[in-house]
Each structure stands twice: as C-alpha cells, then as structure tokens.
C-alpha cells in the first residue's frame, strides 16, 4: 500500500531555550512563537519541491 | 533545554532519510543566526506507514 507520501520523525534539542509549562499549552505566546519559528525554519531548509509540510510538533524538557 | 519532536512529510521518492538529516544539520548555523535557536542532537527516522496514515501532514 503506497500513499505517495513519505513521513519522517525528527527530534532535536534547542540548547539555548529553557523548557517551562507554557510549552505544554498551545495557546501561550511562547508555544506559538516557537512553533511559528520552527515551521518557518523547516520551509527554509526543505525548499525543494518534495516537501509537503510538518505536523505533530511536541515540546519536551531536555 | 527544549526537545522538539515533529513529523515531516515529503512526496514519496523525493528525499531519503540521509538527506533529511543532512540538510537539517547543514542549516544549524543559519538557524542560530536567523532564529536564535541553538540546535543539537538531531535524530531522524522513517515513520512506519500505519502511524503516518493517522498523523497526516499539516
């Protein structure tokens, strides 16, 4: 069964940011700003035609 | 630090797992200057199909 889409799980650390409880709440400014920056960054990195997007962003303490 | 976990979606056949990781790693310096994000410990793996069917691509 082929969907025509490949999915990759990606994990990384951001060492110059501190985790706090607002990163567990998608309604907070801190969460939304970080999510926006990360989404924008991935659009920059994978500029080639095959990139479809990202989903399931989760933040955890490092 | 903050650990970020996410799922990336690509058109099938357009990129292999090695290039997903390499292209991300090569962008780390720019991420630091443009977004003030210091990135380390990058890990990439492919998502088995049954999981990816549920997760969709936003």
């Amino acid at each position: 069964l082929s969907t025509g889409v490949s999915f990759f799980f990606l994990s990384f650390h951001i060492s110059n940011l501190q985790f706090n409880s607002s990163l567990e709440d998608p309604s907070t400014d801190y969460y939304q700003e970080l999510q926006r920056d990360i989404s924008e960054m991935f659009l920059q990195i994978y500029k080639q035609g095959g990139f479809l997007g990202l989903s399931n962003i989760k933040f955890r303490p490092g | 630090s903050v650990v970020v976990q996410l799922t990336l979606a690509f058109r099938e056949g357009t990129i292999n797992v090695h290039d997903v990781e390499t292209q991300f790693n090569q962008y780390k310096t720019e991420a630091a200057s443009r977004y003030n994000l210091t990135i380390s410990d990058v890990s990439v793996s492919d998502v088995p199909f049954p999981f990816s069917a549920q997760s969709g691509a936003g």
């Epitope: 035609g49 | 099938e12 056949g13 292999n16 090695h18 390499t22 492919d46």
Partner: antibody
Amino acid sequence: QVQLVQSGAEVKKPGASVKVSCKASGYTFTTYTMHWIKQAPGQGLEWIGYINPGSDYTHYNQKFKDKATLTADKSASTAYMELYSLRSEDTAVYYCARQGNYAAYYFDYWGQGTLVTVSS
Amino acid sequence: DIQMTQSPSSLSASVGDRVTITCRASGNIHNFLVWYQQKPGKSPKLLVYNAKTLTDGVPSRFSGSGSGTQYTLTISSLQPEDVATYYCQNFWNVPFTFGSGTKLEIK
C-alpha cells in the same frame, strides 16, 4: 557530454599514501555530489563516501573514515580521494561516480576507475 | 547499517530465457533501490533506479520491481550482451551499501 576522467594506476608501498583524482567535464561540477567506490580484485562494490563540491560537505562510510579523505577543487572541476597508511587490503580499483541531481538517488556517470596496488 | 543480500551469486541461463535476480534489504529502503550492470574490466553502468525506473537507453527487456525490503531485477529474454555482474544498491540511508553481486553467464 558528461565525463569523469580519473588519474592513472598507482603502485605504492605499505604505509604510504596515494591521491586519486577525478576530473569532471560536461556539467556544472558544484551542483552534483561526487561519490567514491572501492572494488577489490574479483570482489564487489563498497561505498567509501561522498563530497558535495558546492559546499565541501563530506560524509564517509565509518569503515573508511580513518582511511580516506575526500576533497574537491572547484576551479579545476576535480574531486580527489587521498588514501592513507596503505596496506595490501587497500589494493583495489577505486571509482568516482556522480550522483544525479535533485531527487536523483543513483550514480548516473562513473569514472573509468583507478587501480591502486599496494605491494612491498 | 542496511545489509543487502543478493541472490543467486551466479547464474547460467540460455539465450531467450527469463532471468530473475533478487535483492533483500535488512530494513525497509522505501524503493530507494538501484541496479547496476558491470561488464568485465568496465565501470558499472546504471540500469534501474527508484526500484523500477529504467534509465535512458537501457533495453526494455530489463525491468525492476519490488518494495519495502524485497526487490527484483528481471531480464525477460536473455541476450548474449547481457553477460555481466549485476549489483543492487541501497540509496535510502548511509552507508549506501551494495549487494554482493550476481554473475550472469550464458549456457
């Protein structure tokens, strides 16, 4: 037309080093990744690593990371592979091979091969 | 590392025969599978990429198939000029490993 022309055969003593060249023509050298492959006499193919001549980014097969160094000279459109601390098991034909461009996961052009013989 | 197990290691067939070479990967390589043909004393030549796409100039008697971990190269009607060693290659993840090769001869 695309061509990859490699340097000639070499005979080296154990412990010596050798530098093999791969001169590219017929395409824009910096936009294609160059890989190196080993083939010992009568044996199969073994991937050594690659260099992206545009960024000088390299990636090695762990097995070869202390054996080979890959470089590229953009102005000469030439890729190089230097092999160190040669031993008899390094005797092989070494190929350079171009990886196809965006989303092209294959080697579309190969050099003619360079035989490196290690013998005392 | 992904191991590529190719079979058979050698094969003798008659002109006109249908010939099948198999390559098994130790993990899912998502169709990032390449086939090369190498004639004695020559450099390998690209035959098939993305498991089933025939490269320009390769005769239509060659075809590739498979998915996941299991891949096949088929020659529908063997010709004398097909005498060579055939290699599969994983292009999913580094190291980009090759199969050990299948030496094809004419009976």
